[in-house]
Amino acid sequence: FKNDATEIIPGLREYPEPPQELENNQTMNRAENGGRPPHHPYDTKDVSEYSCRELHYTRFVTDGPCRSAKPVTELVCSGQCGPARLLPNAIGRVKWWRPNGPDFRCIPDRYRAQRVQLLCPGGAAPRSRKVRLVASCKCKRLTRFHNQSELKDFGPETARPQKGRKPRPRARGAKANQAELENAY
């Protein structure tokens, strides 16, 4: 929001770490869609859907010693956008990754503005602030040219290959390591 009255409230973007995806004990080369409701997180019956999940997160907005009278509810974008798109390669003992599809990230799509009233201690007058809250999420393309710091929170399954490196033919017999199997969805 481009609005002079808008203040970014400290701490509003500090989300709790979402739980790790549950392990998928894959015995067959099969990914089945169990049809869970679209925003119910971490359901092992359907980790294969494009599960860019909109998790509801309720918290109080704070600004210094002041705190919102009521908690605000917004969305946390969580989940993986489809199957792993990196393939392991093994040449001798060297293991590296190459892409077999574009990299997508579950990120905020639309925002909404909400005015909140902040109550302050010591009898100070309440403040009114407008905050920007996540309203929806989407699976957005991430290019290899994005700053690597944007990827710091993602593990090896989502690390991009070196810039400019051409995908090489995969070594015969190279198998996906367990990390990829667990995060393949």
Partner: antibody
């Protein structure tokens, strides 16, 4: 020559399931995710989802959630797409497609397509 | 989902004509826009990727341009084999989506 060859036409009743196959040749099957796209008669193209043959992991367009399953058999370099609880509006040509890559532009595109499998849903 | 709107939905042209097809995305898709050609009873064929990159083997009379939300496919001099339906496709946001198609017919 890189080729994707699909199974033959199917006629199904509403509520039934259909399983379409796509046999790949001319490239290393596990190096590319396989995508599925469908086209209803006289209509445009609709992307259904993809599968990673290397891990078996798949991702589907939410429109088909709960009804579609994509699988692969790496020993025969074949991808499968099963659609359940068929309705008349599932009548379409179903295509498998491979995603190609341009390293310079870091971009991807459907560079190889199967010939299509016609699925007719009628009572 | 990102909506891809093509215009016109159909057009009539003669051999040698210059033909322009437009594709508009409902939100910014950068340059992640591909064009496909489809003939009746056949699978689509890739013509152009990344907005303007011509696939190897595609005649140079085909060209693409645009960025963000507005894109154009141009055929500089229409040939008999170019009569077909053309689709745009965005690769920026899942699910991938296609335009409704533009049918190029013989006048």
């Amino acid at each position: 020559e890189v080729q994707l060859v699909q199974s033959g036409a199917e006629v199904k009743k509403p509520g039934a399931s259909v399983k379409v196959s796509c046999k790949a040749s001319g490239y290393t099957f596990t190096d590319y995710n396989m995508h599925w796209v469908r086209q209803a008669p006289g209509q445009g193209l609709e992307w259904m989802g993809e599968i990673n043959p290397n891990s078996g992991g798949a991702g589907y367009n939410q429109k088909f959630k709960g009804r579609v399953t994509m699988t692969t058999d790496t020993s025969t370099s074949t991808a499968y797409m099963e659609l359940r609880s068929l309705r008349s509006d599932d009548t379409a040509v179903y295509y498998c497609a491979r995603l190609g890559y341009d390293d310079i532009y870091d971009d991807w595109y459907f560079d190889v397509w199967g010939q299509g499998t016609t699925v007719t849903v009628s009572s | 989902d990102i909506q891809m709107t093509q215009s016109p939905s159909s057009l009539s042209a003669s051999v040698g004509d210059r033909v322009t097809i437009t594709c508009r995305a409902s939100q910014d898709i950068s340059n992640y826009l591909n064009w496909y050609q489809q003939k009746p009873g056949k699978a689509p064929k890739l013509l152009i990727y990344h907005t303007s990159r011509l696939l190897s083997g595609v005649p140079s009379r085909f060209s693409g341009s645009g960025s963000g939300t507005d894109f154009t496919l141009t055929i500089s001099s229409l040939q008999p084999e170019d009569f077909a339906t053309y689709y745009c496709q965005q690769g920026d946001t899942l699910p991938y989506t296609f335009g409704g198609g533009t049918k190029v017919e013989i006048k």
